[in-house]
Structures are given as structure tokens and as C-alpha cells.
């Protein structure tokens, strides 16, 4: 048995007479032989579930579900109840109604075995019948909605009449009907005004019925019509077996360059017309098992279940259904030497499905694991400026298909033929398994005899000891020129273009910093800034060379504080900034401030220097001119 609603509403007035019928609660059957029996909870509750008093006023007919006043609620009773409502005005009280057989302990009130009946209290007597508006004569203030389980025996789930109105205003005639399209499974009995289902409902055919209830009021000569929505929701049960969309029960996959743990190798989709079990229970009750194979397969693969709600069309309306994606996933990184083919089977079981038929499917995955060979081009040729600064990125080396690799470890090394000319270093990029070549020793770069640098590039997969080699010829170009005195270590320090371009900084391939002019569009990824090389910094990503020293590209790598208009990077740096962003790496601070605009209206007086203490700079103090002050505050 279950209630057709989880909550009911009615009005209560002071001194309403004993015997006044209030409303009917309705139970629907889960099985044809069930007979409902109703009982009331012992207490009345108020605001925030406050237990107010034992219920001495309202009774229920156990067999019909009729609630009625068995004694009048007088003013003193209401005052007593109000006094216990934690100081809140008593506007609403509620009772719990239980469906027997249930435990006699009055605990939580949860649908389907319990419903709450709310009474809106009016500290006046019942109004004169002639003063009641048609809406008040027809329907409760709160619109009801109904829940009916699919595949259950038909039954009565609502009674239209407002019983106190019918009882206290017998001269007013009220008629009801349901507006519904052809062939809908509901009827309203004209005599009893009871609404019932004609037959068992099927949620997979229709999940929601948006009916309209029409009430016609006859009071003397006047006739008025009131219409309200009358929504019915059909509740699901597990009555559909899982199926394969388009009959596809097999997926084939090749594992080659993507060999990283957690890589999705292949996916098969299962469709289930049901939306139960609910999400909290789903993974426990809708099981998937990788059928036993050899030990290697069991260790290497796992199956992940990813359920998702979807909508399907049925009889012209949309109903919810579930698609289950079963992903075959690598459970570990695979060695590049691994080479095998296998068939895997996965058993999917909708354990709540009761039939007819089986709730079990068998999924098939055909997987080929191919070995990976390491190949480098026969040779590389690069040039580097003699003015290049330490950590300047001058090129990349990459084994064949390295951009596509994941889970494949390749370490690059440089072997120099001339010991005193070992200028370059190489680091492996975690992103694309390439090797980034960078200037590691600027002293060697400036030696006249180091005009041509010869290296052997060695790429190694340490797990298998497989290697690839290539020649690297680096030509050193240009003349070394010492930079201006007072140039910062980091290009990022410079806030203006002239001071940026006259200096070099760590990571600069040309020995000069580069100015990136922003687009000036508010907080933007394209903010103005000074960089060692706009190819790599800032690009929203702190690469493996930039991580070597915070002075190279704090715009991408800073973990400290950013002052001013900005959006922080994930996990570090400046994702977007306002105006010009400059940084003081050793202070672990960056500042994003409006572009400096010289104000022609500013006279000598306002150029006098002012001291501002800025709390948001973490105790920094800054002496700046009035025009800067104006921009700072405007910003």
C-alpha cells in the first residue's frame, strides 16, 4: 500500500464545530488483495517540526481515510498550542497519517507509508459562505500533485470536494470534472467526485500527465468556473530488461600510443528503459563483472560503469530512461614492448529486474595491444644566439608519434662531443613526451671556439631500455653584447615597453625581453606583459623549463599572490589579467593594473609624491604620483 500524495492541505478555523469533516486521504494498492487501514500519529507539530501537543482534536476513519474534527478547537486551545511553537506565530500545524500495518512508533514520516496533513490556521471563525470566492469553494490553497506507481492495480486516489465547505455551506452547489484527452487512464465519478485510475499505468509509455481539473460553482443565479492543473506522476519500477542499442554487443580497440593507466580503451552502451534503481543504489544493484580470463588481463583492465539519464520518445511524449556506458579502462601503464591480442567478456546484471526474461547481458571487447618502437629523425639542425640567456628554449626533439604518447616514459639526454662547449640542456616535457632544448651554460655559449656545437640526442625508455639516437648540430650566431646596468633578472619585472625591450632576462633566446601588447579588453588572457619569449611565455601553462626557475615566467608559474584585476591560473600563474601584469618573482607577487595613461590636465602640484599603504599588497607600500593614484583608485 502507498499514499497517492506525500502531503495534504486544509484550513482550520477557531470554533469549527465538532463533527466537521476535513478531508480524505487515499491509499493505492500494490497488490489486488491489499486493504488499507489508516491511523493518525499521536501528536500535532508546528514550525520546524516542533512537537506541540497530543492530538486531541482530529480523528480518522480507519477504513475510509476521512479526517474530521471530533472536538472543536477553541481559542484557549490554540493559545496553548501557540505558546509551544518556539515563539513563532502559529500559522500551520501538521499531523502524520500512517498506513497500517506499520510500526506503532511515530518516527520519520516518509512516503510511501506516511503522509503529512497540514492545516493552515485562521484565528477567526469560519467565514460567511457568501463571502467565499469561487477559488476558495473549489480547491485547497496548495495545488495537489499525485504519485502513482506503474503496473499496480487501479484505484481511487483523490476526492475533489472541500469537505468543510460542503458541510458548512450546503446551499452552494459545486461540480467537478477532469479535462483529459482521449484514452487517458483516469475518470472522475460524477456522484462521489472520486478520481481513480481505469487501469494499471506504464511509466515507459507516459511518465507525466498534466491534467486540468474544472470546478463549476452554482450559487443562486451565478455560475463560475475555476480551472487548476491536476498533475499526476507515474513512479517507476524495474520492469525493463537492459538491451543493446542497435544490437551492438561488441567493441574492438587497438592500444598503441595511449598506454597510460586510466585510459579508456573502448566503450559499450547498454540501454534500460527504467530509471530505477535510483542513482544512490544504481552501481550496487546494476553490476558489471569482468569475466575471469588470464592473470595479465585481470591485472591490466578494469570495467567502469557510467550511468546517465536520457530522454526517449514514447507515444508522443518524452519519458526518462537510462543509458549505461561500460568503459574498458587500463588499470596500469603498459610497457612499450607489450604485444598481444585478447577477447574480454563483461557480464552486466540488472539485479532488481524481476522478468519476464533475463536482466543479464554479455558485453564483448576485442583488444589488440601493439608494441611501440622509438625512432628519431637522422639529424637535427638548430641555431642559437650568442646573446641567449640561461633557460632560453631553442628547440624541441621528439621521437616519432611522441605527441600522441601517454603513459610512455621517454627521457632525452644530450651527449656533447666537445667537453668545453656543453652549452645546452634537455628536459622531457610531460605534456607531449618531447624533449625541450634550452641554454644551460651561457659562459660556454660566449667562447669563440664554440661556434658549432655537436651533440648526440639519445631518447630512452628506461622500462625496456629501448633507445633511439640522432645527431644534433647547433650553430651559434651573432655577437655577445653585455646588457644595460640595472636590468632585472626576470623580464616580468618590467611594467613598460621601453624598459622591457632594453633588457634581457632569464629564458630570453635573443638576449632581449619581448613586449606583448594586450588587447585591452578588461580581464583578458591577452594582457600586456614583458616576456623572455612570447612563443612560450605567458601561454597559460608553466612548462618543464619554466619550472626550473621562478624568474623565467612568473606569469605562468607564480604560486604567490596576484594583486589587481585577474583570474588565477590553474594551478598557478595568471590565467587572465587587467591591463598590464608585471611580477616580482622573488617576492612571489604579480600586479595587474590599468595601462598607464599620461593625463595632460595634471599640473605640477599633483605630481607631488604621495605615500599609499596598500593592505592588499600584503603590507607593501608604494610611492606613486597623483596620476597613478587616480588610476589606481579608478581601477
Amino acid at each position: 500500500l502507498y499514499f497517492s500524495r506525500d502531503a495534504y492541505w486544509e484550513k482550520l478555523y477557531v470554533d469549527q464545530p465538532a463533527g466537521t469533516p476535513l478531508l480524505y486521504v487515499h491509499a493505492l494498492r500494490d497488490a489486488p488483495e491489499e486493504v488499507p487501514s489508516f491511523r493518525l500519529g499521536q501528536h500535532l507539530y508546528g514550525t520546524y517540526r516542533t512537537r506541540l501537543h497530543e492530538n486531541n482534536w482530529i480523528c480518522i476513519q480507519e477504513d475510509t481515510g476521512l479526517l474530521y474534527l471530533n472536538r472543536s478547537l477553541d481559542r484557549s486551545s490554540w493559545e496553548k498550542l501557540s505558546g509551544r511553537n518556539r515563539g513563532f506565530p502559529l500559522l500551520t500545524v501538521y499531523l502524520k497519517v500512517f498506513l497500517s500495518p506499520t510500526s506503532l512508533r511515530e518516527g520519520e514520516c516518509q512516503w510511501p507509508g506516511c503522509a503529512r496533513v497540514y492545516f493552515s490556521f485562521f484565528n477567526t471563525s469560519f467565514p460567511a459562505c457568501t463571502s467565499l470566492k469561487p477559488r476558495e469553494l473549489c480547491f485547497p490553497e496548495t495545488r495537489p500533485s499525485f504519485r502513482i506507481r506503474e503496473n499496480r492495480p487501479p484505484g481511487t486516489f483523490h476526492q475533489f470536494r472541500l469537505l468543510p465547505v460542503q458541510f458548512l455551506c450546503p446551499n452552494i452547489s459545486v461540480a467537478y470534472r477532469l479535462l483529459e484527452g482521449e484514452g487517458l487512464p483516469f475518470r472522475c465519478a460524477p456522484d462521489s467526485l472520486e478520481v481513480s485510475t481505469r487501469w494499471a499505468l506504464d511509466r515507459e509509455q507516459r511518465e507525466k500527465y498534466e491534467l486540468v481539473a474544472v470546478c463549476t460553482v452554482h450559487a443562486g443565479a451565478r455560475e463560475e468556473v475555476v480551472m487548476v492543473p491536476f498533475p499526476v506522476t507515474v513512479y517507476d519500477e524495474d520492469d525493463s530488461a537492459p538491451t543493446f542499442p542497435a544490437g551492438v554487443d561488441t567493441a574492438s580497440a587497438v592500444v598503441e600510443f595511449k598506454r597510460k593507466e586510466d585510459t579508456v580503451v573502448a566503450t559499450l552502451r547498454v540501454f534500460d528503459a527504467d530509471v530505477v534503481p535510483a542513482s544512490g543504489e544504481l552501481v550496487r544493484r546494476y553490476t558489471s563483472t569482468l569475466l575471469p580470463g588470464d592473470t595479465w588481463t585481470q591485472q591490466t583492465f578494469r570495467v567502469e560503469h557510467w550511468p546517465n539519464e536520457t530522454s526517449v520518445q514514447a507515444n508522443g511524449s518524452f519519458v526518462r530512461a537510462t543509458v549505461h556506458d561500460y568503459r574498458l579502462v587500463l588499470n596500469r601503464n603498459l610497457s612499450i614492448s607489450e604485444n598481444r591480442t585478447m577477447q574480454l567478456a563483461v557480464l552486466v546484471n540488472d539485479s532488481d529486474f524481476q522478468g519476464p526474461g533475463a536482466g543479464v547481458l554479455l558485453l564483448h571487447f576485442n583488444v589488440s595491444v601493439l608494441p611501440v618502437s622509438l625512432h628519431l629523425p637522422s639529424s637535427y639542425s638548430l641555431s642559437v644566439s650568442r646573446r641567449a640567456r640561461r633557460f632560453a628554449q631553442i628547440g624541441k626533439v621528439c621521437v616519432e608519434n611522441c605527441q600522441a604518447f601517454s603513459g610512455i616514459n621517454v627521457q632525452y639526454e644530450l651527449h656533447s662531443s666537445g667537453a668545453n662547449c656543453s652549452t645546452l640542456g634537455v628536459v622531457t616535457s610531460a605534456e607531449d613526451t618531447s624533449g625541450i632544448l634550452f641554454v644551460n651554460d651561457t659562459k660556454a655559449l660566449r667562447r669563440p671556439k664554440c661556434a658549432e656545437l655537436h651533440y648526440m640526442v639519445v631518447a630512452t625508455n628506461h622500462q625496456t631500455s629501448r633507445q633511439a639516437q640522432a645527431q644534433l648540430l647547433v650553430t651559434v650566431e651573432g655577437l655577445y653584447v653585455a646588457e644595460e646596468a640595472g636590468c632585472p633578472l626576470s623580464c616580468a619585472v618590467s611594467k613598460r615597453r621601453p624598459e622591457c625591450e632594453e633588457c634581457g632576462g632569464l629564458g630570453s633566446p635573443t638576449g632581449r625581453c619581448e613586449w606583448r601588447q594586450g588587447d585591452g579588453k578588461g580581464i583578458t588572457r591577452n594582457f600586456s606583459t614583458c616576456s623572455p619569449s612570447t612563443k612560450t611565455c605567458p601561454d597559460g601553462h608553466c612548462d618543464v623549463v619554466e619550472t626550473q626557475d621562478i624568474n623565467i615566467c612568473p606569469q605562468d608559474c607564480l604560486r604567490g599572490s596576484i594583486v589587481g584585476g585577474h583570474e588565477p591560473g590553474e594551478p598557478r600563474g595568471i590565467k587572465a589579467g587587467y591591463g598590464t601584469c608585471n611580477c616580482f618573482p622573488e617576492e612571489e607577487k604579480c600586479f595587474c593594473e590599468p595601462e598607464d595613461i599620461q593625463d595632460p590636465l595634471c599640473d605640477e602640484l599633483c605630481r607631488e609624491q604621495k605615500l599609499i599603504s596598500e593592505e592588499d599588497l600584503g603590507g607593501e607600500q608604494k610611492l606613486i604620483s597623483e596620476e597613478d593614484l587616480h588610476h589606481h583608485h579608478h581601477h
Epitope: 619585472v493 622573488e586 617576492e587 608604494k622 597613478d628
Partner: antibody, heavy 123, light 107 residues
Framework: QVQLQQSGPGLVKPSQTLSLTCAIS??????????WNWIRQSPSRGLEWLGR?????????TYAVSVKSRITIDPDTSKNQFSLQLNSVTPEDTALYYC?????????????WGQGTLVTVSS | DIQMTQSPSSLSASVGDRVTITCRAS??????FNWYQQKPGKAPKLLIY???SLQSGVPSRFSGGGSGTDFTLTISSLQPEDFATYYC?????????FGQGTKVEIK
């Protein structure tokens, strides 16, 4: 030849303000490539960097977190000097205080130091 | 804050000895590292900056090495005027921090 000459009282009462000045000769307080620092030394804390001021288009100050709420370092371009103010002192602030020039852009090493001023905080 | 740990805290040596002092940083500081010498009643004096660059006017018997977290100061042949306390310092991130000092005494 750069020289730094320190001046200021050697005795300060608890809760009062410690004030020291460092006069610069042979360089400018507004120089673009250096920063002007205060450092103190005590048996309990060893050498402790307190803060700095430097000029690059604007004046900037940076302070150690341990004293940030109490410290002010001010440049004085007219007298080519810079000063330290440390508020609300306690006996813990008793130390030998040094001013020093720091090379701002090649790793901030301190190549010139003042002679030091022993400050005792006592009532 | 970056911690700087010097060892040993003191050592005894004779004139002409080769002396090595080490300093370890609590995190990678690349070469943002300096060595200072301090004699009683005097301010510290810069010996080595950027881990291995000799400050002008400092005798060539002093040399610095290391990068990352481990650094050394070597005095190739100890002279009478070298008996003093030596401090290391990092300038990678603020606050700049110093080691606790190594006192070199006459044996």
C-alpha cells in the same frame, strides 16, 4: 666607493618606536639596480632580514612577514638616505641593526653594509 | 620560509689547511645563494654571490660551489685573517634567510 652611515638611539623603551637612519654616499637611494635593506642580528635569531625599499619607476617596499605589521622603511631622496621605523617594540627586538645595499637584479646579494647600531629595548 | 642549515656549526683548523663549509636549503634555490664572512664587532662582508662568483677584492683562495639545495664554501689554504664566522644566505624568495653560521677557530 659606497659607504653607509647609520644613526639613531641605542636605547628604546618597550611599546615605543625604534627609529634608525642610513645615510648613503657613493650611490643614490633612487638607483634603479639596487635595493636598500635593513637586517638585524641577535644571539637568539641570528641574522634576520627585515625589509627593503627600492625604486623602479615607482617606490616599492617589501617586508619580512615576522615584522610586517610593525615596520616602515622610507626613502628620503633629498637627503639620499633611508630609514627604519619599528613600532611597538619588545625586549625581543633587542639586536644589532644593519643597513645594507642589495643588488636587486642578480640575486640580491648585500655588497655594502653599515657599521651596525646596537639597539636595546628596556624600560 | 626557506630554511638554511649550515654544517658544521664550528670547526678548528690550522693555517694552511683546506677548509670546507656546507649549507643546505630546505628547497631548490638554483644559484640564488651567497656566502658572507663576519669578524667580531664588524658587519658581515660578501665573499661569494650567485653560488660561485667571487666578489671583487676577495682573495682567490675562497671558492663556492653547488646548485639547487646543496652548497659549499672552500678555503683552499687557510690564512690567519680567515678566522671568523661564515654565513650562507638564500635570495630565491622573500624573506631572504641566512644560515646559523659556522665559526672557524684556530686549532
Amino acid at each position: 666607493q659606497v659607504q653607509l652611515q647609520q644613526s639613531g638611539p641605542g636605547l628604546v623603551k618597550p611599546s615605543q618606536t625604534l627609529s634608525l637612519t642610513c645615510a648613503i654616499s657613493g650611490d643614490s637611494v633612487s638607483s634603479n639596480s639596487v635595493a636598500w635593506n635593513w637586517i638585524r642580528q641577535s644571539p637568539s635569531r641570528g641574522l634576520e632580514w627585515l625589509g627593503r625599499t627600492y625604486y623602479r619607476s615607482n617606490w616599492y617596499n617589501t617586508y619580512a612577514v615576522s615584522v610586517k605589521s610593525r615596520i616602515t622603511i622610507d626613502p628620503d631622496t633629498s637627503k639620499n638616505q633611508f630609514s627604519l621605523q619599528l613600532n611597538s617594540v619588545t625586549p625581543e627586538d633587542t639586536a644589532l641593526y644593519y643597513c645594507a645595499r642589495g643588488h636587486r637584479y642578480s640575486g640580491s646579494y648585500f655588497d655594502y653594509w653599515g657599521q651596525g647600531t646596537l639597539v636595546t629595548v628596556s624600560s | 620560509d626557506i630554511q638554511m642549515t649550515q654544517s658544521p656549526s664550528s670547526l678548528s683548523a690550522s693555517v694552511g689547511d683546506r677548509v670546507t663549509i656546507t649549507c643546505r636549503a630546505s628547497q631548490n634555490i638554483n644559484s640564488y645563494f651567497n656566502w658572507y664572512q663576519q669578524k667580531p664587532g664588524k658587519a658581515p662582508k660578501l665573499l661569494i654571490y650567485a653560488a660561485s662568483s667571487l666578489q671583487s677584492g676577495v682573495p682567490s683562495r675562497f671558492s663556492g660551489g653547488g646548485s639547487g639545495t646543496d652548497f659549499t664554501l672552500t678555503i683552499s689554504s687557510l690564512q690567519p685573517e680567515d678566522f671568523a664566522t661564515y654565513y650562507c644566505q638564500q635570495t630565491y624568495t622573500i624573506p631572504w634567510t641566512f644560515g646559523q653560521g659556522t665559526k672557524v677557530e684556530i686549532k
